[in-house]
């Protein structure tokens, strides 16, 4: 019986460890600055790193600019978006800006897109200052189903800060769906 | 066999409970206002509370102004930094401010420091208003190894809000590394 | 013995799954725009949705405008609050605004209320611009006891953005208390 108990314990340790790891998808995606769209309108950001520097992904998929859920669950989603402008880049078209981020969820089964979280600010970036900067952070807890896709839209993409510590988004699974 | 099963179940409950608690380090550190540096340049904040009010720590270490990781894992890191100024404190040097936070990771083995997250804003704090306030929040999911250290750098530390609900940072372990 | 092992494994799977779900309360509450108070003073927001759109709750209770903890534990708490104004709504009383959020904890046993997190900004919303927007995000890791209540206070509630992706708060349990 002792041997049997050891076997039970052993199999449980394996099972617990394996199921715990499998049950916890995550992603932290950082902006790919080589392919930031221009303009001041609202656009979807499709170029993100998933495997260099701080960027990483596990049990989720990054495809066509979207973070794809592979496992049903409740996830904490977050995004940090930084905008900046230096006078050496030339003058802005306008001193009044709307700097915004929208974290959206798309369901393939029912082709529809919905905004989960938004944040940002209107800003007056006066020509009297040589440098301007602004960051947005949003986060929230959402039920995600396998196949659903998370994407990021921003206004004024040409002003995005291309650093990996500045402009990123991510998700991690917290628990299963009952 | 029933007794044996009970023993297996019992030992498993203990093991599961114990390993779950051990596997989940966390910290929530609040600013120690008695020792905030002056100046408007970027400085590392080294004085934080870890055991009073909302501040707490478990399975991590706070030493020399840094939060030290004791256990490999993926952690959610966050920081909330508030800046404020009232005219009764005297006039500012300039009306333009860069109010920033940098969450950095230092590896002792390979002596290097890297910024994981940054946030903030340039602000125009006009002398026409008697009070000014601004808060930054950043958060993200990172792989941390035992011995690595997390620290906080800010610009304009003399403007920090010293309240425990205003200026703090923290971390909690979400999952093991595969 | 093989049958017994299967039974042990089976009961453990049930137990592990059940205890994991029971051990992880959460809530994501979105603003109920039909009942936002007026004025520019600091007020407690009592109308939130808990079961429509992105709003959801499990193993926590929403009552009298407060999120009630049913299970001791360490929780990650967060809030996202958006303010906005369009000139079509009429002029603001003042161009200088303090846009703030306070996440508070109330203990029934010891009738007291404490601010866990605060964030926001003073803003100059000039009449020269037809639209203004600003979002605040705060988050932190806190020990909560059964019966304690979380509530949200804001300044200038009449400026709140009523969208579910804009103004919300939430919590999820990360771990037990040792």
């Amino acid at each position: 019986i002792r041997a049997e108990k050891a076997m039970v314990d052993g199999s449980w340790l394996d099972l617990a460890k394996r199921s715990k790891l499998e049950a916890q998808p995550f992603a932290h995606l950082t902006i790919n600055a080589t392919d930031i769209p221009s303009g001041s309108h609202k656009v979807s950001l499709s170029s993100w790193y998933h495997d260099r520097g701080w960027a990483k992904i596990s049990n989720m998929t990054f495809s066509n600019g979207k973070l794809i859920v592979n496992q049903d669950g409740f996830y904490y989603l977050y995004a940090n978006i930084c905008f900046r402008h230096h006078e050496t880049s030339g003058d802005l078209a306008t001193e009044y800006l709307q700097l915004m981020v929208y974290v959206t969820k798309t369901s393939i089964k029912i082709p529809s897109s919905h905004t989960l979280m938004k944040g940002g600010s209107t800003k007056y970036w006066s020509g009297n200052s040589e440098f301007h900067f602004y960051s947005i952070n949003v986060g929230g807890f959402f039920k995600l189903r396998s196949g659903e896709e998370i994407s990021i839209e921003v206004s004024n993409p040409s002003l995005l800060d291309p650093d990996q510590d500045a402009t990123y988004f991510g998700a991690f699974k917290v628990r299963d769906i009952d | 066999i029933r007794a044996e099963k009970a023993m297996v179940d019992g030992s498993w409950l203990d093991l599961a409970k114990r390993s779950k608690l051990e596997a989940q380090p966390f910290a929530h550190l609040t600013i120690n206002a008695t020792d905030i540096p002056s100046g408007s340049h970027k400085v590392s904040l080294s004085s934080w509370y870890h055991d009073r009010g909302w501040a707490k720590i478990s399975n991590m270490t706070f030493s020399n102004g840094k939060l030290i990781v004791n256990q490999d894992g993926f952690y959610y890191l966050y920081a909330n930094i508030c800046f404020r100024h009232h005219e009764t404190s005297g006039d500012l040097a300039t009306e333009y401010l860069q109010l920033m936070v940098y969450v950095t990771k230092t590896s002792i083995k390979i002596p290097s420091s890297h910024t994981l997250m940054k946030g903030g804003s340039t602000k125009y704090w006009s002398g026409n208003s008697e009070f000014h306030f601004y808060s930054i929040n950043v958060g993200g999911f990172f792989k941390l190894r035992s011995g690595e250290e997390i620290s906080i750098e800010v610009s304009n530390p003399s403007l920090l809000d010293p309240d425990q609900d205003a200026t703090y940072f923290g971390a909690f372990k979400v999952r093991d590394i595969d | 013995i093989r049958a017994e092992k299967a039974m042990v494994d089976g009961s453990w799977l049930d137990l592990a799954k059940r205890s994991k779900l029971e051990a992880q309360p959460f809530a994501h509450l979105t603003i109920n725009a039909t009942d936002i108070p007026s004025g520019s003073h600091k007020v407690s927001l009592s109308s939130w949705y808990h079961d429509r759109g992105w709003a959801k709750i499990s193993n926590m209770t929403f009552s009298n405008g407060k999120l009630i903890v049913n299970q001791d534990g360490f929780y990650y708490l967060y809030a996202n609050i958006c303010f906005r104004h369009h000139e079509t709504s009429g002029d603001l009383a003042t161009e200088y605004l303090q846009l703030m959020v306070y996440v508070t904890k109330t203990s029934i046993k010891i009738p007291s209320s404490h601010t866990l997190m605060k964030g926001g900004s003073t803003k100059y919303w000039s009449g020269n611009s037809e639209f203004h927007f600003y979002s605040i995000n705060v988050g932190g890791f806190f020990k909560l006891r059964s019966g304690e209540e979380i509530s949200i206070e804001v300044s200038n509630p009449s400026l709140l953005d009523p969208d579910q992706d804009a103004t919300y708060f939430g919590a999820f349990k990360v771990r037990d208390i040792d």
């Epitope: 020509g127 009297n128 200052s129 040589e130 440098f131 | 002056s38 100046g39 408007s40 340049h41 100024h85 005297g90 006039d91 500012l92 040097a93 300039t94 009306e95 333009y96 401010l97 860069q98 340039t122 125009y124 002398g127 610009s155 304009n156 003399s158 403007l159 | -």
Partner: nanobody, 125 residues
Framework: KVQLVESGGGLVQTGDSLRLSCAAS????????MGWFRQAPGKEREFVAV????????KYADRVKGRFTISRDNAKNMVYLQMNSLKPDDTAVYYC??????????????????WGQGTQVTVSS
């Protein structure tokens, strides 16, 4: 974007006075802290004085305290340095500089964004 031009330097005797002026153009400097630095031959550039954006707060290097006075006129986009009781070791090129951001005064050159070309002050014994 900001151009600074110093004037008022020259050759004077020990104990004399000089008034340096700094004219700013290209952008209003009324939101900036404005400072004076000096650099003697073979030495590092050193802080002399700084004035905050509205002229309500001043800071001086210890060696000029009580002898030099910094002032500004935001309407004219001008900054001044009144130098009294000059000594031979005040001899240097004097630079006007703009600190464009920050809650506290900068006393190191790195904290200043815009600089003038400098004006020579020579104090003979």
């Amino acid at each position: 974007k900001v151009q600074l031009v110093e004037s008022g330097g020259g050759l004077v005797q020990t104990g004399d006075s000089l008034r340096l002026s700094c004219a700013a153009s290209g952008r209003a400097i009324g939101s900036y802290a404005m400072g004076w630095f000096r650099q003697a031959p073979g030495k590092e550039r050193e802080f002399v004085a700084v004035i905050n954006y509205r002229g309500s707060s001043l800071k001086y290097a210890d060696r000029v305290k009580g002898r030099f006075t910094i002032s500004r006129d935001n309407a004219k986009n001008m900054v001044y340095l009144q130098m009294n009781s000059l000594k031979p070791d005040d001899t240097a090129v004097y630079y006007c500089a703009a600190q464009t951001s920050g809650a506290d005064f900068g006393t190191t050159p790195q904290r200043y964004t815009y600089w003038g070309q400098g004006t020579q002050v020579t104090v003979s014994s």
